[in-house]
């Protein structure tokens, strides 16, 4: 067992051109905090994969307000170290993710807003018990300077914190088979301690805190016999003695999740969903307080000042779970209407609306005629979120600003000829036809289909269409 310690020295603009804008402003003061996530080995998993070695959240830094016109300086940092306790051996190689979060303190509806400012990641080799290692990482235009170390918690010692030391019982030498503990020559290696509760008959360990099962036994403490009587849901190889398939231990057999955690199988292993107050790969870490930084993804920890009182994580938008460890697919609820597309921006949900629609969920069909005049006597017609002008005669285009060619549609019937006129069009009708559009034949007896021609117009005269 031991503790990984991280000290943030500075966070600010990196060298070179393109200094980033200050994340805080006079209108929106803010403060920074950091989250560290550790994974064993030289992991290249996505940032969302579990922090199997542990995670920690810093305190909030001092409130910062940008000085107008000034470049972004190194920003004020939270006090103290980030500490990630590890219960088992220190792996020697590890991956880290350090996130810089901004908490905006403006007039936010529903409390402060969190947003991820920068994320740096890396893979390192580190022996426990060594000196502080210094590092500089850049994320875009930001630069983070930090140092880190891993140290063992007594009685563990060594580069992996796997050797246990106890004061000598006799002044002269250590017990049978046990060596002195270098560099603490006055202490002796202690015998291996298996995981608490590991069956002494059916389990053994080669590393402290481990519980490996003898053949025929399974479960986290090797207390569950492997069944040979049932051939249902076969999993393992065929048994020569019974002739049926003996279930090999599935990742969730015997429930490896401690403290009431529930186990679910994953493609490569298993995942424990822990009850509040417990975390770790197998929900084995208990007595958690807010000082342990149990809330992931920028969750705010409340209560839990001592190990006996529970803490509560207030999760930022987009995360849920007792430790804010689960990302919510908020867009899967289809909140956007009228063909709007849903964007989950982490700190907020946004609907990108199609033309003609507006509102937080694209629920408003825009009144496109409001404040939008149609020129030259046209009238506005709404429909489907789009605005359209019904133009007066002689005009066209989206806003009736274009002078239309009234003859373009060939409005004069029966071979009549069309003439554009300032107030519309005029049809010169072919012999035998009359009317505004030459639509009426003149009867052979001289009478027309119309009751009478208007005074002053003879059949065949050009008809002006008003």
């Amino acid at each position: 067992a031991g503790v990984f310690e991280l000290q943030i020295h500075s966070f600010g603009p990196g060298p070179g051109p393109g200094a980033p804008r200050s994340p805080c402003s006079a209108r929106l003061p803010c403060r920074l905090f950091f989250r560290v996530c550790l994974k064993p080995g030289l992991s290249e998993e996505a940032a969302e994969s579990p922090c199997a070695l542990g995670a920690a959240l810093s305190a909030r830094g001092p409130v910062y307000t940008e000085q107008p016109g000034a470049p972004a300086p190194d920003l004020p940092l939270p006090d103290g170290l980030l500490q990630v306790p590890f219960r088992d051996a220190w792996p020697g190689t590890f991956s880290f993710i350090i996130e810089t979060w901004r908490e905006e303190l403006g007039d936010q509806i529903g409390g402060p807003a969190w947003s991820l400012l920068a994320r740096v990641a890396g893979r390192r080799r580190l022996a426990a018990g060594g000196p502080w290692a210094r590092d500089i990482q850049r994320a875009g235009a930001w630069e983070l300077r930090f140092s880190y170390r891993a140290r063992c918690e007594p009685p563990a010692v060594g580069t992996a914190c796997t050797r246990l030391c106890r004061p000598r019982s006799a002044p002269s030498r250590c017990g049978p088979g046990l060596r002195p503990c270098a560099p603490l020559e006055d202490e002796c290696e202690a015998p291996l301690v298996c995981r608490a509760g590991c069956s002494p008959e059916h389990g053994f360990c080669e590393q402290p805190g481990e519980c490996r099962c003898l053949e025929g036994w399974t479960g986290p403490l090797c207390t569950v016999p492997v069944s040979t009587s049932s051939c249902l849901s076969p999993r393992g190889p065929s048994s020569a003695t019974t002739g049926c398939l003996v279930p090999g231990p599935g990742p969730c057999d015997g429930n490896p999740c401690a403290n009431g955690g529930s186990c679910s199988e994953t493609p490569r292993s298993f995942e424990c969903t822990c009850p509040r107050g417990f975390y770790g790969l197998r929900c084995e870490v208990s007595g958690v307080t807010c000082a342990d930084g149990p809330c992931f993804n920028g969750g705010l920890c409340v209560g839990g000042a001592d190990p006996d009182s529970a803490y509560i994580c207030h999760c930022p938008p987009g995360f849920q779970g007792s430790n804010c460890e689960k990302r919510v697919d908020r867009c899967s609820l289809q909140p956007c209407r009228n063909g709007g597309l849903c964007l989950d921006l982490g700190h907020a949900l946004r609907c990108r609306c199609r033309a003609g629609f507006a509102g937080p969920r694209c629920e408003h069909d825009l009144d496109d005629c409001a404040g939008r005049a149609c020129a030259n006597g046209g009238t506005c017609v709404e429909g489907g979120g789009a605005h359209r002008c019904s133009c007066a005669l002689g005009f066209g285009g989206r806003d009736c600003r274009e002078r239309a060619d009234p003859c373009a549609a060939r409005p004069c019937a029966h071979g009549g000829r069309c003439y554009a006129h300032f107030s519309g069009l005029v049809c010169a009708c072919a012999p035998g036809y009359m009317g505004a559009r030459c639509e009426f034949p003149v009867h052979p007896d001289g009478a027309s289909a119309l009751p009478a021609a208007p005074p002053g117009l003879r059949p065949g005269d050009p008809q002006r269409y008003l």
């Epitope: 991820l116 994320r119 597309l341």
Partner: antibody
Amino acid sequence: QVQLQQSGPGLVKPSQTLSLTCAISGDSVSSNSATWNWIRQSPSTGLEWLARTYYRSKWYNDYEVSVKSQITINPDTSKNQFSLQLNSVTPEDTAVYYCARGGIVGAPDAFDIWGQGTMVTVSS
Amino acid sequence: QSVLTQPPSASGTPGQGVTISCSGSSSNIGSNPVNWYQQLPGTAPKLLIYSNNQRPSGVPDRFSDSKSGTSASLAISGLQSEDEADYYCSAWDDWLNGYVFGTGTKVTVL
């Protein structure tokens, strides 16, 4: 896993119509969370988004403004595929054409699955 | 043709870091998430980072991005030979009502 398989001719004559099809496996063209896109790439213009179709209670289509009058995108639910038609092609339409899915919930702008690409040459 | 501007090339030796910039405007990068794609020679682009520093599974955390105002940048730390490829930024543009891509940056591992 989700795969997109493109089909269509590699050579089209100028002024003719280019037709490409993208067959979807492992997802549905009528998915309520995906968008289905056509993108092309040429040395002269780089990557260029052309069109998309998607279903949210009904079908919606969007087109890149400069090719809007020339292009049609159509989903085919019976065959679980979508197609692109580009009318009156010119040598400038010579490019590698890709279909792609915008399939990450909450990130419709991110094209997470791409077809293999079809090299289309417009030449007489 | 491309609305987003990237440097044509960037290079570094193995283990070094390299940063690619992507400059846009208020209607694209300024108001929408940025996505980054990696394109190896002769293959289709592959989504590398989406919605401002989210990575699809399988993408190493050596790749990270950041955004400030109307510019974004992609940082590759611990450069490896397999990182040699073309990199494109992309975002939705509210003004054009369509997706826009960057001009592309060729990363060479020396």
